[in-house]
């Protein structure tokens, strides 16, 4: 399965929406900066079969959706932008799910690397714990927004390789 061109466009739109969501100058939140340990190796795509890469991307986007659809998130971000953000994430999840359904028929393909799924989950656990520790402060959300933007940019490289991969 090849991810459609619209998938890459949706990813770019997601990044643009996240950029627009910023309400506070990042410079005023420097003291709140945190290294969440983005699992770059899970998004390099070299050791992956395509089906496994798709399931890792799906997990990342699904966790992002859940992170930004909490009550605390709704109280922080502009509602119109959040709705647009959800729409783009759903589009990407649908694209990936369509691909996953096709991969089911491919024999001898491990459909998921469970350790990679767990690694992505742990990355989002670190983000969630940071937010709860900081009591969901505006600066904490700003730090998380910047982190998710960064993670989407890094994962976009894998998505692009998947789109072109035969």
């Amino acid at each position: 399965c090849d991810l459609p061109q619209t998938h890459s466009l949706s990813n770019r739109r997601t990044l643009m929406i996240m950029a627009q969501m910023g309400r506070i100058s990042p410079f005023s939140c420097l003291k709140d900066r945190h290294d969440f340990g983005f699992p770059q190796e899970e998004f390099d795509g070299n050791q992956f079969q395509k089906a496994q890469a798709i399931s890792v991307l799906h997990e990342m986007i699904q966790q992002t959706f859940n992170l930004f659809s909490t009550k605390d998130s709704s109280a922080t971000w502009d509602e119109t932008l959040l709705d647009k953000f959800y729409t783009e994430l759903y589009q990407q999840l649908n694209d990936l799910e369509a691909c996953m359904m096709q991969e089911v028929g491919v024999e001898d393909t491990p459909l998921m690397n469970v350790d990679s799924i767990l690694t992505v989950r742990k990355y989002f656990q670190r983000i969630t714990l940071y937010l709860t520790e900081k009591k969901y402060s505006p600066c904490a959300w700003e730090v998380v927004r910047a982190e998710i933007m960064r993670s989407f940019s890094l994962s976009a490289n894998l998505q692009e390789r998947l789109r072109r991969k035969e």
């Epitope: 399931s55 799906h58 699904q62 966790q63 959706f65 859940n66 992170l67 659809s69 999840l93 990936l96 799910e97 996953m100 359904m101 459909l111 998921m112 469970v114 350790d115 767990l118 989950r121 742990k122 989002f124 656990q125 670190r126 969630t128 714990l129 937010l131 709860t132």
Partner: antibody, heavy 119, light 108 residues
């Protein structure tokens, strides 16, 4: 509010199969992995496995791979677990629990289904 | 798999007494993924403490959790009747996820 509804009890014969259900409400079903946990009378908890309702992929505890099969029906927002070749060892309460992160990990459980295997 | 051993299996405490339940892991568990659940007879488990030391919503402040690596504990600063229950530790640091065998806490 988040709710997971499970039937109270199932009585089954040795060697037979049973399909347990877990109906979700109060949240977007496809957004969270659903887990299944076994508890034998007066004993600890055992994690059986999990399923992502969004795409149906599963992760199993090796100890249950030949015993349990996890599925979902998105249209009825219900998760299922089929247990096969039942023996007295399978007599237990089976819970479904919703995944999540931080304070939401296993924060929501079904009431459990008591499976009794008896001739 | 990571085996979680809880001790004691059963214990009794008087009202007002300080209680400590322990959970020992067969190999190291990251504290972010160590949880505790409370269960009363005939009910499903309830999330009690998440990520080693954070109290779940509605859990009384007399409860606390601590630990790292292979050694974790749940402490009740002053036992109350409503705390009588079984407590299970749980890890999701690695597959397969595991639970301890539980400590049944009774009131004297």
């Amino acid at each position: 509010q988040v709710q997971l509804q499970q039937p109270g009890a199932e009585l089954v014969k040795p060697g037979a199969s049973v399909k347990l259900s877990c109906k979700a409400s109060g949240y977007t079903f496809t957004n969270y992995w659903m887990h299944w946990v076994k508890q034998r009378p007066g004993q600890g908890l055992e994690w059986i496995g999990e399923i992502n309702p969004s795409h149906g992929r599963t992760i199993y505890n090796e100890n249950f791979k030949s015993k349990a099969t996890l599925t979902v029906d998105k249209s009825s927002i219900t998760a299922f677990m089929q247990l096969s070749s039942l023996t007295s060892e399978d007599s237990a309460v089976y819970f479904c629990a919703r995944g999540g992160l931080g304070p939401a990990w296993f924060a929501y459980w079904g009431q459990g289904t008591l499976v009794t295997v008896s001739a | 798999q990571i085996v979680l051993t809880q001790s004691p299996a059963i214990m009794s405490a008087s009202p007002g007494e300080k209680v400590t339940l322990t959970c020992s892991a067969g190999s190291s568990v990251d504290s972010s993924y160590l949880y505790w659940y409370q269960q009363k007879p005939g009910s499903s488990p309830k999330l009690w403490i998440y990520s080693t030391s954070n109290l779940a919503s509605g859990v009384p402040a007399r409860f606390s959790g601590s630990g790292s690596g292979t050694s974790y504990s749940l402490t009740i600063s002053s036992m109350e009747a409503e705390d009588a229950a079984s407590y299970f530790c749980h890890q999701w640091s690695s597959y397969p996820f595991t639970f301890g065998s539980g400590t049944k806490l009774e009131i004297k």
